[in-house]
Structure formats: structure tokens, C-alpha cells
Interface confidence: low
Amino acid sequence: EAHKSEIAHRFNDLGEGHFKGLVLITLSQHLQKSPFEEHVKLVNEVTDFAKACVADESAQNCGKAIATLFGDKVCAIPSLRETYGELADCCAKEDPDRVECFLQHKDDNPNLPPFERPEPEALCTAFKENNDRFIGHYLYEVSRRHPYFYAPELLYYAEKYKNALTECCEAADKAACLTPKLDAIKEKALVSSAQQRLKCASLQKFGERAFKAWSVARLSQKFPKAEFAEISTIVTSLTKVTKECCHGDLLECADDRQELAKYMCEHQDSISSKLKECCVKPTLQKAHCILEIQRDELPTELPDLAVDFVEDKEVCKNFAEAKDVFLGTFLYEYSRRHPEYSIGMLLRIAKGYEAKLEKCCAEADPHACYAKVFDELQPLIDEPKKLVQQNCELFDKLGEYGFQNALAVRYTQKAPQVSTPTLVEYARKLGSVGTKCCSLPETERLSCTENYLALILNRLCILHEKTPVSERVTKCCTESLVNRRPCFSALHVDETYVPKPFHADSFTFHADICTLPEKEKQVKKQMALVELVKHKPKASEEQMKTVMGDFAAFLKKCCDADNKEACFTEDGPKLVAKCQATLA
């Protein structure tokens, strides 16, 4: 139903606390450089305005669209051009062009210092002084670093953060209580951020159909007892919610998400028995619980897929009459039977099936043409299975650090034009997938691996789009969302790359490396490894092993020496010469 004042409607639905949090997130995600105090001032102004509209929906400006109100607020900031440069040019445009312009200026990699966690004592003092302000600061710091974070989920994590502090600041050993809790929140929030970023990229770069297909596959896996019509209804609402959040319409997104959770709880009998435990929780926890819900058990006696999608005489008729519905049904039926497959695999299978029908339904004997379609789709299943098995074996053999090194070599050979710090960052992220997924049972390994890889490659693609350096990376990132991972896997040594000239500085180390924390020490060594591959992209595995072994021995020797710096100065050039000889 239409409301006279959209902002009053959302204020009433969400309540003042969540309303203010969402306004703060909106501002922080768009104006990533502004100080916290400036945002707080704007949040209070917007909230006061919303309250005035609640009191009188006909009051001046209350009928304006929320996006327009936000745009007007941003464009009224006196220092806008000074702080944000060409973002200020957006203010010359009319909505909806102004909104699109603001979105294009969101920075996925803002030049901000890492979000360091203060000492527990300092955290608790600040929290006790003013916990609303403290939680506001958390929302601000996360939002400006993650400008596409799923806003209602961020409110949930802020609530978890608040609960952890409420509990632990009273504990005798604050650090022992807080550290594991905040580490867990941080890890889950980072995954949540990456998941939402992939959803937004899917919508923005590949369109609504791609996102809906992704959602059908995921929801069919989670709710295999629900009918296709029910899954479709949820997917339609979920698409609206996701589009709103990705578009920066966070008040609408959070409100509509609440509505979707309410709908799912009202219809839980026809969706999933697992919803019961979620539906008794309060608003934020309820929606989060549904998002993370354990999949329901498969219905018994499911007929063979071939009955409806190969043997049925009406296959081509059904395909021609309602292509998307027929393919959607195929994706639903396939996904609910295969909770162990990744979303990417399911979408590639559906795409393969579609391509087969496109070809066969135009032929004289369609059935003869598509009769063996499932056999022909088998390589789409075997390829990722084999890849996961090989990589997990390598991970088990080498451990996380060694596995990261192997990936650093592999990805440098695939895209040597990418900067060394970026290659190390992604090798480390890809390597951590081994830790996350390889210890899981066979049934979960495959989906865990490919679903995480999709998140990591999406981030790589987003940052590469900002500063493109490799045509092969651009090709893998833009041609097809579902084929990104197979595309990267298929890349081998870049034959067009001219090896980097040898620079001794890239392999020169000093005594300060000895006192670095283990993680930073690893990163330094991995930077040298990547530089080495850029210098000799076709070096054999044996040569690399020898060089890395010599390198480790050199570091150990010099870090154990009485006069460390003298050892580095004397033995460093010898090591460089030895490495060059090994790789010659």
C-alpha cells in the first residue's frame, strides 16, 4: 500500500534504534572518509526529520523518496567537493541518476588504516562510558571499510558485539572472555561481507536472472521439502531485498527483510521444519538464523530426474512455452537432490542442460539428441570433485603455509601482471580455504571449497576492475559468473608475459624480519617467492623447492646468529647468487 510519507513508514516499522543504525550505515557506506562526529550529526538531523514526519505525514518534504532525502542531505555538506572531489559532481544530476552516481563512487578498497581492536580494558571503559555511541562507532568503522555490507546483518553483528562486551566487561579476565568472542564475530562478519558483495556483483554485473538462479539453487538445497512455487515466491522477495540493500536503500531493505522473515515463519509448514527454532527469536536474530539455517532433510521417494527432464515426451514443448519456469524447475529439482554440490556447479549443470535443449529442440528427433544429456553433464561434476581432492591432498601434505606458497606460485604464473602484494593476499586467502574446508566430511568439502572460492575470486575481480592489469583476469571475471572459478583453474603459465628483470632489492632482507610476528614473516617470504616467479615464471617445482629451502635455511641461520645484521649483509648476496644459479 502507498504511504504518504515513506520515511515515516520506515521509522514506524523499524523503530528508532534500528532506524538510526541504518541511517548511520547508509552515510558511512557512501561517505567513507568523513569523521564519525559528522555522521552522528547528520543521523540526528535525519532522525528528527523522520519523527516530525511521523507526527505529520503531510509536513514539508515528508512525501519525498528516501533516496532523494539522503541525496539532498549529502549534497548540502559544505566540504563535499573538498573531501570527495568528483563525487560532488553527482549533485548536479537529478534522481535516479544522482543515486546511481553516488553508488559508482563507493570504494571497495578505501585507503583507511586497518580496524585495530583496542585493549580489552580500553574497550570496556569506552563501552561503559556510552554504549550507544560505542556501538555506533562499530557500525561506522565496519561500514566505511565494507560499503556493501548487508545492513540488517551488520545490525545483528553489532548486537552480538554489544552482548559480548556487556558480558565480558564484567568478567575477571576481560581478555580471555572477549578475545574468542570478538574473533568469532569478526570472522563471521568478514564472510558475511564477502557473501553480500558477491550478491551485489551478481545483480549489478550479470543481472537479475543470474541472481535469481543463484537464489533458487541455494534455497532449494536448504529447503528441499518446499514446493517450487514456494521457492519462487521467496526468491522474488529476496531479490527485492537484495537489490534494495545493494542499491543503498537500506531502510527499505531492512524493513522488507523483516517482512520476508515474517512470511517465512507464517508459512514454515510448507517451507522447512528447521524454521521453528528461528521463528521464536527476536527480529534481527530471526532473520540471521534463517540466513544461516541448517538444511532440511531430503524428502523420501524423490523420482529420478530423468523422468521429467529426459524421458517426458513434452520436454521441448515445456521448454518452448515457458523457458525460465522450466529451467527454474530443473534447477530446483536438481539442487534439492544435491545439497553436497556448490552453487556454481548447480548453475553450470543447469546452463549445460539449457544449451543442450536449445540445440536438440531444433532438431528432427529431439529425444534422441538429448537422451544422454546427464552423461554429457558428468564432466561438470567430475572436474570440481577432482580439483578439490587434489588440492586437499596437497593441503594435507604441505600444511596451510606450504599450501599458500604453492598457490602463490600457481597464481603468479596465471597472472604475473598483478601486483605482488595482491598476489600474496589472494594466495593466502585461497590457502585458508584449505583450512576451512579440507577437514570437512566429503559431503561438505565440495560446496565449502567452491562457495568460498567464489567469494575470494569476486573480490579479486572487483579490485582488478578498478585497476586492470591482466586481460586474462578481465576475461575470467567478466565472461560468466558461474564459470569464473573453472576459468581461473584453466589458466596456466602466461606465455605472453615478459619475465621481470632480476632486482636484488626484492630478495634483500634485514635483521628486523627476525622479530616480526609469524604471519608477517610469512608474508615477507611469500612476497619474495612471488617476485622469484615473476623473474622465472617457468621454473620447475623442484627448482622452486630448492630455492625456498635455501631461503629458509638462510633466515634461520641469520636469525640465530649473534650479529644478525652482519649475517644478513654477508650471506644475503651469496643467497641471491645461489638462487640465480639454481634458476638459470
Epitope: 552480538k160 574468542p180 568472542k181 574473533d183 568469532a184 564475530i185 570472522e187 541448517q294 594435507d396 583450512t435 576451512k436 574446508c437 579440507c438 577437514s439 570437512l440 566430511p441 559431503t443 561438505e444 565449502c448
Partner: nanobody, 124 residues
Framework: EVQLVESGGGVVQPGDSLRLSCAAS????????MGWFRQAPGKEREFVSA????????YYANSVKGRFTISRDNSKNTVYLQLNSLRPEDTALYYC?????????????????WGQGTLVTVSS
């Protein structure tokens, strides 16, 4: 619904050892991360140790590192906690917990199912 039943607690002297067991039923045991927590009288519940689904990863609180060992036998749906060199400050009710998340955590709110606990008393 997973049910967890702990056993093996008792009264021992400082320096002694104990082996706690936790038997699980009602779920696919090998898909759960298993953890041990403890709660001393009048204190908060605290994390002790956790083990991943295939026993590849184990994690310990600093206060028990080197003294306690966690292990699991997926064929028997059981997780164990070996307590060596026990100290009076180890006196507590020890709880077994199961988490269905794909990563293991030291945070109690990440665990979905809990046992009733088994009491360990270390006293001279």
C-alpha cells in the same frame, strides 16, 4: 536433535589424571565441531578445548595447554578430554558441546547443543 551425555568426572588429588567422555546421539556426529567448556562455582562458563570434524584441528585455552588433550572417535560418536596434571583451579562442571558451523570457535554462543555436564573436583 543431538543429545550429549558426559561421563568420567570425579574427585581427584592435585597432579592426578582423569578422562572425560561425551557420547552423542541423534545427529551425524562427524559433521559437528565438538568442544569442552567448564564452569567453576560462582564463575562464568569458559572455553576449554575444541576439535574439528576430522580431528585435523584442535584448540585449547591457554590455562590448559600442554595438560589437557582432546580427541574424538567418529565411529563411536564420542569425544574425549584427557585431563593430566590436574590443579585445584580445574575444579568445575565440565560441559560437552556440539557446533554445526564449518569453522570451529571458542565462543560458547556458536555451539548449538550442550550436555548436562560432569563434575571434576581437584582437592587435597
Amino acid at each position: 536433535e543431538v543429545q550429549l551425555v558426559e561421563s568420567g568426572g570425579g574427585v581427584v588429588q592435585p597432579g592426578d589424571s582423569l578422562r572425560l567422555s561425551c557420547a552423542a546421539s541423534g545427529g551425524t556426529f562427524s559433521t559437528y565441531v565438538m568442544g569442552w567448556f567448564r564452569q567453576a562455582p560462582g564463575k562464568e562458563r569458559e572455553f576449554v578445548s575444541a576439535i574439528s570434524q576430522n580431528s585435523i584441528h584442535t584448540y585449547y585455552a591457554n590455562s590448559v595447554k600442554g595438560r589437557f588433550t582432546i580427541s574424538r572417535d567418529n565411529s563411536k560418536n564420542t569425544v574425549y578430554l584427557q585431563l593430566n596434571s590436574l590443579r585445584p583451579e580445574d575444579t568445575a562442571l565440565y560441559y560437552c558441546a556440539a557446533s554445526r558451523f564449518t569453522s570451529w570457535y571458542t565462543a560458547d554462543y556458536e555451539y548449538d547443543y550442550w550436555g548436562q555436564g560432569t563434575l571434576v573436583t581437584v582437592s587435597s
